[in-house]
């Protein structure tokens, strides 16, 4: 039975040209995390595999950085980065957990950043 839950940064906003940390945290389960995928709509941005480490999609290499932790840092944001992002946790023995984050990239310099989520 899957007992875990994914906590995410939720809905966040950031300024064009700035950077933002996408963060998820799996709690309430003792399942072992074997891999975390980060996806934007249907595009795979990055994977962190417990055995093989990080791999960033070459298409996003210049603007995506691994971490902190199992999170993902998006840099040099453009308005085209606005949209849904998903963290997909592969775990053993539970299976797959998915978290959703909505990022809005604003032209204005008064963009309110969502609270940065820290993994305890």
């Amino acid at each position: 039975m899957m007992t875990g839950t994914i906590e995410t940064t939720g809905n966040i906003s950031a300024e064009k040209g700035g950077s933002i940390i996408l963060q998820c945290h799996l709690s309430s389960t003792t399942a072992q995390v074997t891999q975390v995928n980060w996806e934007q709509q249907d595009q795979l941005l990055a994977i962190c595999n417990a055995d093989l480490g990080w791999h960033i999609s070459p298409s996003f290499k210049d603007r995506v950085a691994p971490g902190p932790g199992l999170g993902l840092t998006l840099q040099s944001l453009t308005v085209n980065d606005t949209g849904e992002y998903f963290c997909i946790y592969h775990t053993y023995p539970d299976g797959t957990y998915t978290g959703r984050i909505f990022l809005e990239v604003l032209e204005s310099s008064v963009a309110e950043h969502g609270a940065r989520f820290q993994i305890p």
Partner: antibody, heavy 117, light 107 residues
Framework: DVQLQESGPGLVKPSQSLSLTCTVT?????????WHWIRHFPGNILEWMGY???????IYSPSLKSRISITHDTSKNHFFLKLNSVTSEDTATYYC??????????WGAGTTVTVSS | DIQMTQSPASLSASVGETVTITCRVS??????LAWYQQKQGKSPQLLVY???TLAEGVPSRFSGSGSGTQFSLKINSLQPEDFGSYYC?????????FGAGTKLELK
Amino acid sequence: DVQLQESGPGLVKPSQSLSLTCTVTGYSITSGYDWHWIRHFPGNILEWMGYISDSGNTIYSPSLKSRISITHDTSKNHFFLKLNSVTSEDTATYYCARGSFWYFDVWGAGTTVTVSS
Amino acid sequence: DIQMTQSPASLSASVGETVTITCRVSENIYSYLAWYQQKQGKSPQLLVYNTKTLAEGVPSRFSGSGSGTQFSLKINSLQPEDFGSYYCQHHYGNPLTFGAGTKLELK
């Protein structure tokens, strides 16, 4: 178009080190992707050996970890395999390959290495 | 290590036929499975990754399916250039491992 080409001695003596070079053309090895070594044994078995990432991090197969080293020379766009203490069981065709999310989308032509005295 | 069991080990078929090769995996790898084709004296070529995504330039007569521990590669309407060896590979953990191969021969 990205191309990979393996080079190195075709014959290595037992207990010595095997050293191979992979020359990459058409793509910078620091611009993304991982750079892998894979070998194909005479019995038609493929074995993944390890890789070096675009940033220089290395991951090795646990069965080879004690005697393998993968390095790169970014100025020449080469990466290298060194396998220590070889035996006849290391006789194989050695391939370098480009990896995306740990599958291999471009392979070199391969180079045959025989371990024999 | 994750074990990859391919079947059949060899297969004879005629041009125009449809064939299916299977790969059974010792543990759940979700959809992280690739297929390669290798012709005599040549290097392997990527056909499919993530179970069902065709690599660039691969004809649509090739298709992959499955999930978890059971996967297959189907080739519709075999062409003369399709004969050779086929290998599955998981891209999920260390070590990355391959199946022992399926040799597809002309009947």
